[in-house]
């Protein structure tokens, strides 16, 4: 299989393009979070359903050649590598929690009387650190809905409420998958709160909204993309475990024009250490909290994973030998808070902030729509991918 870094970048960008078709405003999701949920489904699917999901984890080239003729045994071994990679990644991520509030949580909510393969439930726990919660969909669908919502709320410090709206769960529901990613990080260098000022954020050339604009002047990884007329900036989080990358077009309405010129491969290349260089940057970044939830069945089906969400095509025989099981609901929700908080600069360094544009300083003024993603540097996995276009 491809590395989690490559897979999450590819899925992140492909999913972004899919979500963009029906979303004008902010888009925000966790590619790696969604991948863990896909992995959990893959674990329980067989046949064509599994093959469709498996393709997410392989590059086009690999899929088209050797894998098509792969024997069943080889496919199973490949699949195991996928799950082992997630096990390793989730273990690594859990070690970061002293410095960050970072939770990647998967939970299956299963009809309490429905029969599941014991082996599947054991594996889900082993590889995905996920548990299965029994709920009474049959006799208490709405109560079950509320139970799931309050669990989500508790896992996100009350930031994500009513993930499942009224009527979204019925008595015929057998299985609900919830993937949730919550992140509140500390920058490697804090933004001084006293430098945060109210400023206009231009959604387009004629419409603006007020934002709290954080500012700092420091050395950052930077690259200028001449053909795209855009800048990329890397902002490290504490201990450099994670970084946020901002892709800011020069023009207010430049983002739409350049999206088609971006590919997952280019994103990886542009943000690689060899491509970016340390530059002094005057950075202006809005303080923002984004929370987004997506019902992923239709979106993933549009991306070629339709069988898993089709009552008539789904093969979940690795999860249950009872017929008719499929993921009726696959909800992904993510939350990130971008605030001033970070490691306080030691007084001795005495970095003062000047608003004037000093010679040799790059200006990265995020006061119009930009793309951003948060990367786990050790695995190169994309924790979050988003478009900030509307405060």
């Amino acid at each position: 299989m491809d590395s989690l870094g490559a897979v999450s970048t590819r899925l992140g960008f492909d999913l972004f393009k899919e979500l963009k078709k029906t979303n004008d405003g902010n888009i925000f999701f966790s590619p790696v979070g969604i991948l863990t949920a896909i992995g959990m489904v893959l674990l329980g699917t067989r046949g064509a359903t599994a093959s469709q999901l498996e393709e997410v984890f392989h590059s086009e080239k690999e899929t088209k050649s050797s894998r098509i003729k792969a024997e069943e045994k080889e496919v199973i071994e490949n699949t195991e590598a996928v799950h082992q990679q997630f096990q390793k990644f989730l273990t690594e991520i859990s070690k970061l929690t002293n410095d960050y509030e970072l939770n990647i949580t998967n939970r299956l909510f299963g009809e309490k009387t429905y029969l599941f393969l014991q082996k599947y439930l054991d594996y889900v726990e082993k590889y995905y650190h996920a548990s299965l919660e029994p709920v009474d969909f049959v006799n208490a669908a709405d109560e079950s809905r509320k139970k799931i919502n309050s669990w989500v709320e508790s896992k996100t410090n009350e930031k994500i409420k009513d993930l499942f709206p009224d009527g979204s769960i019925s008595s015929s529901t057998k299985l609900v998958l919830v993937n949730m990613v919550y992140f509140k990080g500390q920058w490697d260098r804090e933004f001084k709160k006293e430098n945060t000022k109210e400023e206009k954020f231009w959604m387009n050339k004629s419409t603006s909204k007020s934002v709290q604009m954080m500012t700092q002047s420091h050395s950052f990884s930077f690259t200028f993309l001449e053909d795209l007329q855009a800048k990329i900036l890397g902002i490290p989080y504490k201990n450099n475990d994670l970084s946020m990358f901002v892709l800011l077009p020069n023009d207010i309405d430049g983002l739409e024009k350049i999206i088609d010129k971006i590919s997952p491969e280019k994103l990886v290349e542009w943000t690689s250490p060899g491509h970016m260089e340390e530059r002094k940057v005057n950075l202006h970044l809005p303080r923002f909290e984004v929370e987004d939830g997506y019902d992923l069945e239709a979106v993933l089906a549009a991306m070629g994973m339709g069988d898993a969400f089709s009552e008539h095509k789904a093969d979940y025989s690795g999860m249950s030998s009872g017929s008719g099981l499929y993921a009726q609901k696959f909800l992904h929700s993510s939350f990130v808070a971008v605030t001033e908080e970070g490691t306080e600069a030691a007084a001795a360094t005495g970095i003062g902030f000047t608003v004037t544009s000093a010679p040799g300083h790059e200006n990265v003024h995020c006061n119009h729509p930009f793309l951003f993603f948060i990367r786990h540097n050790e695995s190169n996995s994309i924790l979050f991918f988003g478009r900030f276009s509307s405060p």
Epitope: L117, Q118, D122
Partner: antibody, heavy 132, light 107 residues
């Protein structure tokens, strides 16, 4: 087709040991938990011991705890019951039985071997006689 | 530990007749995890019913199970010659205990 072929029974003196085997074929052995169930001559059925699909979890009836050990070798598609310190009351026909691979969420969380799982296929049985 | 009491001990009937077998638990069988097995002389038991009322694969529809809580019933709507055997109920929801059996014999 699905088969559970048993071996290892025989006559043994009280205090002696015996190892029963059960060779499985016709299904994916490591998808299933397995159990041993016994039946004393002319009597009813008694669950003896169970093991989950990967051997990570085992359970025993109070009457055999500390004397019997259940194990499995998934590579060989085989189930075993090591019986030590045998007593006259252990005399019975011993069956290996495949547990249903399915469990409800509720019973799965109880984490007890064999709980929530019926026995959908049985071996032909092997007789163990403990007599002096 | 749950004790299962089956009644009657023996049921003498003719082919074509209806057989009603009872199984009473000393405490509630959790989740209706009650199974019924059939055993003929010299043969291992065969699963008939699981979950109190679901027929196992290949079991004819003349066999049906019902009940919940502490009272369960196995019904054979029309006895066939091959149905004469001993029937056991089993609580597999907590204690994995079996009842003592009901023998259905030819009258």
């Amino acid at each position: 087709q699905m088969q559970l072929v048993q071996s290892g029974g025989g006559v043994v003196r009280p205090g002696g040991s015996l190892r029963l085997s059960c060779a499985a074929s016709g299904f994916t052995f490591d998808d299933y938990g397995m159990s041993w169930v016994r039946q004393a001559p002319g009597k009813g059925l008694e669950w003896v011991s169970g093991i989950n699909w990967n051997g990570g979890s085992t359970g025993y009836a109070d009457s055999v705890k500390g004397r019997f050990t259940i194990s499995r070798d998934n590579a060989k598609n085989s189930l075993y019951l090591q019986m030590n310190s045998l007593r006259a009351e252990d005399t019975a026909l011993y069956y290996c039985a495949r547990e249903s691979s399915m469990t409800t969420v509720t019973t799965y969380l109880l984490r007890e071997v064999g709980v929530g799982l019926d026995f959908d296929y049985w071996g032909q049985g092997t007789l163990v006689t403990v007599s002096s | 530990e749950t004790t299962l009491t089956q009644s009657p001990g023996t049921l003498s009937l003719s082919p074509g007749e209806r057989a009603t077998l009872s199984c009473r638990a000393s405490q509630t069988v959790s989740g209706s995890y009650l199974a019924w097995y059939q055993q003929k002389p010299g043969q291992p038991p065969r699963l008939l019913i699981y979950g109190a009322s679901s027929r196992a694969t290949g079991i004819p529809d003349r066999f049906s199970g019902s009940g919940s809580g502490t009272d369960f019933t196995l019904t054979i709507s029309r006895l066939e010659p091959e149905d004469f055997a001993v029937y056991y109920c089993q609580d597999y929801g907590s204690s994995r205990t079996f009842g003592q059996g009901t023998k259905v014999e030819l009258k």
